[in-house]
């Protein structure tokens, strides 16, 4: 049976998490690298692509499924594969740490990719200013 | 219609074990992250541990960490919650639960529970 | 780790408004659940992400979350929602429930 509760990741819940995964973190994933990509043909897309190809790595399980969520709700999730850098690996951490820097910046200046967006927009100079606190 | 019956449930002397069961029905079992909560008479509601939706990550609550372990069989839609070294204060209900995203957020069916009883 | 903080009890009159808190450091940047549990029973979800109701909850059920303060606020409270609260966010890659209210319907 269908469930009464149809939850989707919002910003505020990725910010979050990379904001966990990132803080005090010189590596992730023993180091793995990855196809750099650009986050402005579609981020959620986008980073998931690179970061799917990550196997073996806790650390990122959660990222990887709330993008997986956020990119399924996105009419032109398929449009992606052509904006990837074929020639330009990065480390796992500097790809989450380019995601993360990106989604402050669209939910700063509301270029907002889906509903729950929106109504997290008027929170972002919180964020700004108090990811440091967050808890691990 | 989605069900979750938990089983297993017993009195036990500290330091014994026991194995939890959960039977989940009236939905696809494998497409879901689960988790166990358990609560102490009169007490609130404590996360114990929880499990990805194909087994590939658990993650437990300190107070249970080193001697529970949460596992689940797909193809038989059960959750399981093996408990060694108990413990007096493990004394509770344990509640089997179901988490609607596949990311790990929150639960939106609960079974009825079972009664563990942790006494000398 | 996370510590969740409600009131142990709420009392309001029958048909009045009754606002349940739930504090932590930052829960703004969290997504707040809720969850009613009457004697003998199991939990039941009644907010989910701040301010979602599922599908069954009745609409005098609403919650918000700003500043420092998630709230569950149940306008015309009837005797049926004796019962009690429990707010929930995900943190230290688990679930952390708070301590829990207590809500009596007077009257």
């Known amino acids: 049976s269908p469930s009464p509760v149809t939850p989707s990741p919002t910003l505020k819940e990725l910010i979050e998490e990379l904001v966990n995964i990132t803080q005090n973190q010189a590596s992730l994933c023993n180091g793995s690298m990855v196809w750099s990509v650009n986050l402005t043909a579609g981020m959620y897309c986008a980073a998931l692509e690179s970061l799917i190809n990550v196997s073996d790595c806790s650390a990122i399980q959660r990222t990887q499924r709330m993008l997986k969520a956020l990119c399924s709700q996105k009419p032109a999730a398929g449009q992606i594969s052509s904006e990837r850098s074929r020639d330009t690996k990065i480390e796992v951490i500097q790809l989450v740490k380019n995601l993360l820097t990106y989604v402050r910046g669209v939910y700063r200046h509301g270029n907002f990719r889906g509903l729950n967006d929106i109504f997290e927009a008027q929170k972002i100079e919180w964020h700004e200013h108090h990811h440091h606190h967050h808890h691990h | 219609e989605v069900q979750l019956v938990e089983s297993g449930g017993d009195s036990v002397r500290p330091g014994g074990s026991l194995r939890l069961s959960c039977v989940a029905s009236g939905f696809t079992f494998s497409r879901y992250n689960m988790g166990w909560v358990r609560q102490a008479p009169g007490k609130g509601l404590q996360w114990v541990a929880w499990i990805y939706d194909g087994g590939s990550r658990t993650s437990y609550a300190d107070a249970v960490k080193g001697r529970f372990t949460i596992s689940r069989d797909n193809a038989k839609d059960t959750l399981y919650l093996q408990m060694d070294d108990l413990r007096v204060d493990d004394t509770a209900v344990y509640y089997c639960?179901?988490?609607?995203?596949?990311?790990?957020?929150?639960?939106?069916?609960w079974g009825q529970g079972t009664l563990v009883t942790v006494s000398s | 780790s996370y510590v969740l903080t409600q009131p142990p009890s709420v009392t309001v009159p029958l048909r009045q408004t009754a606002r349940i808190s739930c504090g932590g450091d930052?829960?703004?940047?969290?997504?707040v659940h809720w969850y009613q549990q009457k004697p003998g029973q199991a939990p039941v979800l009644i907010i989910y992400q701040d301010s979602n109701r599922p599908t069954g909850i009745p609409e005098r059920f609403s919650g918000s979350n700003s500043g420092n303060m998630a709230t569950l606020t149940i306008r015309g409270a009837l005797a049926e929602d004796e019962a009690d609260y429990y707010c929930q966010v995900w943190a230290n890659d688990g679930y952390v429930f708070g301590s829990g209210t207590q809500l009596t319907v007077l009257g």
């Open positions: 639960a179901r988490d609607p995203s596949s990311w790990g957020s929150l639960f939106d069916y």
């Open positions: 930052n829960i703004r940047s969290k997504n």
